[in-house]
Interface confidence: low
């Protein structure tokens, strides 16, 4: 590309527009598959997170690897291709009219991506149309250096958005989690995700989900009634991937939403969540930005108690300890609180029914100039058996019309040199947040009270 294209709602044409389903549709998959078979997997999973600036936890608190560091490292490992699915891109401060030094990590990431293209590593981006970041020029900048960009018209196709957030690097490494390609995700918003290294089986399975977006990003694309066979997955909740992660016996699979973008063999995201909840016998701890047992974006709004019922049933019928940590920020919709109070009202310790709900408030401090920040954007759940890391908020639309992915991981505890299982690490991160001064019980949150840190 010789031109940095001006902002446009139209299609950024990649070099390889597919002529038919499943033929020539992959930006870099075919040559990689053969390559990857020659290499032995030695999967490793690392939890990653962003802790907003000026959000100190108690000294000695556990923490995951910083997300910005993990992203830069992933790009350093890239040798052939980087495929990114992200709701929107906004890696520089002026994108949103902000001049703040905390955007520099995002700008460093954009610089790294430009260097990557200079090294003849292919970059393919699937992003949402419509987008939130209308003024961002990140993708024009990258297209100028040769990136292939497709804007997936989920609004037209399913009345949703492309809300997924994941990377597939060289068909071997993965990032997935709550963070968009946004500088605020690195320094101003609390995020949680996972990086999986050297795991071609899982990476190429997630790549198939990327390919569903890719083929829908061409002009006049339509949703297929049945997805072609080459999009099918053989890794799902009935047949998870089984392998050693740092020597620890592990099962894992990726789920996806909406069902219309789940080719044969792909476990729908909602089904994965319900399965993890259903298998819990001791506890279910969930941290999500939003919790609505309703639709959120379709009108008239419908009641949708699927996840709510599953939590209630686990607590009431099996005595599972349920803890729900929901974000509370300046942009939080206050109509969420009655649903949270209703869920907590089920709690009855005398009858061994334990349901606790807290809101997590990130102090705004002197960062009030940065819009849509200072929130806990994480979307994860952990039980004694499994870790679930997702990209979706908990309301109907995210599972019925909007794209997302989930990662379900179970590790066998035992005498392992590598330390705690993934689910134990995630539990500890949850407990850190839950017991911190930023997590406030609903009783401390008066009806209609703003989500402003009271200190």
């Amino acid at each position: 590309w010789q031109v940095r294209r001006p902002p446009t709602w139209g299609q950024v044409q990649p070099k390889d527009v597919p002529r038919s389903w499943g033929h020539g549709s992959s930006p870099a998959l075919e040559p990689l598959e053969a390559e990857v078979r020659k290499q032995r997997d030695s999967c490793q999973l690392v939890l990653v997170e962003s802790i907003p600036q000026d959000l100190p936890f108690a000294a000695g608190s556990l923490s995951a690897q910083p997300l910005g560091q993990a992203w830069l490292q992933l790009l350093d490992t890239a040798q052939e291709s980087v495929h990114v699915a992200s709701y929107y891109w906004s890696l520089t401060g002026p994108d949103i009219g902000v001049n703040d030094s905390s955007s520099q990590l995002g700008e460093a990431l954009l610089q790294k991506l430009q260097q990557l293209l200079g090294r003849n590593i292919s970059l393919a981006v699937a992003t949402s149309s419509p987008t939130l970041a209308r003024k961002s020029t990140d993708l024009q900048v990258l297209a100028a250096r040769g990136a292939q960009v497709r804007r997936v018209p989920m609004g037209r196709l399913t009345r949703g958005v492309l809300h997924s957030k994941f990377w597939v690097v060289d068909g071997r490494h993965i990032y997935m989690g709550s963070a968009n390609m946004d500088w605020r995700s690195l320094t101003q918003v609390k995020e949680l995700g996972a990086v999986i290294y050297n795991c071609s089986h899982l990476a190429q399975d997630l790549e198939k989900t990327f390919q569903t977006y890719w083929v829908l990003g061409v002009p006049k694309a339509v949703l297929p009634k049945t997805w072609p066979q080459n999009f099918s997955s053989h890794i799902n909740r009935f047949q998870p991937f089984q392998g050693l992660f740092d020597g620890v016996p592990t099962t894992a699979y990726f789920s996806a939403s909406p069902p219309a973008l789940c080719p044969q063999g792909r476990t729908p995201d909602l089904e994965a969540l319900l399965a993890v909840m259903g298998s819990a016998q001791e506890f279910i701890y969930a941290s999500v930005m939003e919790y609505f047992p309703t639709t959120r974006f379709s009108h008239p709004r419908r009641y949708w108690p699927v996840l709510d019922n599953a939590l209630r049933a686990a607590a009431f019928s099996k005595g599972v300890r349920v803890r729900l940590l929901v974000s509370c920020g300046l942009n939080t919709d206050p109509t969420m609180f009655p649903y949270l109070r209703s869920l907590q009202a089920l709690s009855n310790p005398a009858a061994n029914v334990s349901v606790d709900v807290k809101v997590f408030i990130v102090p705004v401090g002197n960062h009030s100039n940065i819009p849509f920040s200072r929130v806990n954007h994480s979307k994860f759940m952990v039980t004694e058996k499994a870790a679930y890391i997702g990209t979706s908020n908990w309301s109907e639309d995210y599972f019925s019309s909007t794209t997302g992915v989930g990662l379900v991981v179970t590790q066998s505890p035992g005498a392992q040199p590598a330390g705690a299982t993934v689910q134990e690490q995630l539990r500890q991160l949850f407990e850190r947040d839950w017991s911190s001064r930023y997590a406030v019980g609903l009783d401390g949150q008066a009806p209609g009270q703003d989500c402003v840190w009271q200190g």
Epitope: V3, P6, E107, L110, Q111, N120
Partner: antibody, heavy 118, light 107 residues
Framework: QVQLQQPGAELVKPGTSVKMSCKAS????????MHWVKQRPGQGLEWIGD????????NYNEKFKSKATLTVDTSSSTAYMQLSSLTSEDSAVYYC???????????WGQGTSVTVSS | DIQMTQTTSSLSASLGDRVTISCRAS??????LNWYQQKPDGTVKLLIY???RLHSGVPSRFSGSGSGTDYSLTISNLEQEDIATYFC?????????FGGGTKLEIK
């Protein structure tokens, strides 16, 4: 610290070619674009093109496509620009500059003064 | 190509003055605007990149602002060492293009 070293001057005859160098130090040469910029006496700056030493990828200003050829030698961390079929219009100072964050040219060489004269 | 126009080709100011140099692009360049200083001996330095980001080692008296097509460089407290020619450059659309320069002199 980042340094870009260029020879001070070149005197060449019309119709011939000249190949000027830019030796980089103080950073990873293969990780940054190298730009070349022309400045005629008493005039402004004109971007000629850039090259990525890690892969030899190049971009050229259309105006200089048949005039300039950009190359690198990664073993010596040196970028080169060859100008061909020289005329008096090519008499100028030529700068190399490293492409830094967001494509800003963050470090510049001292410039090579090329004089085309018979 | 995008044309970059610096309407003031030369500017006289006194030491200690606040000086503003402007630059206009022929189309929206989305903040991809850089400012350079060229000393009389030909030495070129980056001052500001991406409209308002100060390059390392540049004194804080230099600042940049703007958006869309209109941008400016401000020197808040002019010093003798600031005597130079200042160029703007857009990095939004290849080929990168420079303004004609503004020569700053002491009154």
């Amino acid at each position: 610290q980042v340094q870009l070293q260029q020879p001070g001057a070149e005197l060449v005859k019309p119709g011939t070619s000249v190949k000027m160098s830019c030796k980089a130090s103080g950073y990873t040469f293969t990780s940054y674009w190298m730009h070349w910029v022309k400045q005629r006496p008493g005039q402004g700056l004109e971007w000629i093109g850039d090259i990525y030493p890690g892969s030899d990828s190049t971009n050229y200003n259309e105006k200089f496509k048949s005039k300039a050829t950009l190359t690198v030698d990664t073993s010596s961390s040196t970028a080169y620009m060859q100008l061909s079929s020289l005329t008096s219009e090519d008499s100028a100072v030529y700068y190399c500059a490293r492409g830094g964050w967001l494509d800003a040219m963050d470090y510049w060489g001292q410039g090579t003064s090329v004089t085309v004269s018979s | 190509d995008i044309q970059m126009t610096q309407t003031t080709s030369s500017l006289s100011a006194s030491l200690g003055d606040r000086v503003t140099i402007s630059c206009r692009a022929s189309q929206d360049i989305s903040n991809y605007l850089n400012w350079y200083q060229q000393k009389p001996d030909g030495t070129v330095k980056l001052l500001i990149y991406y409209t308002s980001r100060l390059h390392s080692g540049v004194p804080s008296r230099f600042s940049g602002s703007g958006s869309g097509t209109d941008y400016s460089l401000t020197i808040s407290n002019l010093e003798q060492e600031d005597i130079a020619t200042y160029f703007c450059q857009q990095g939004n659309t290849l080929p990168w293009t420079f303004g004609g320069g503004t020569k700053l002199e002491i009154k």
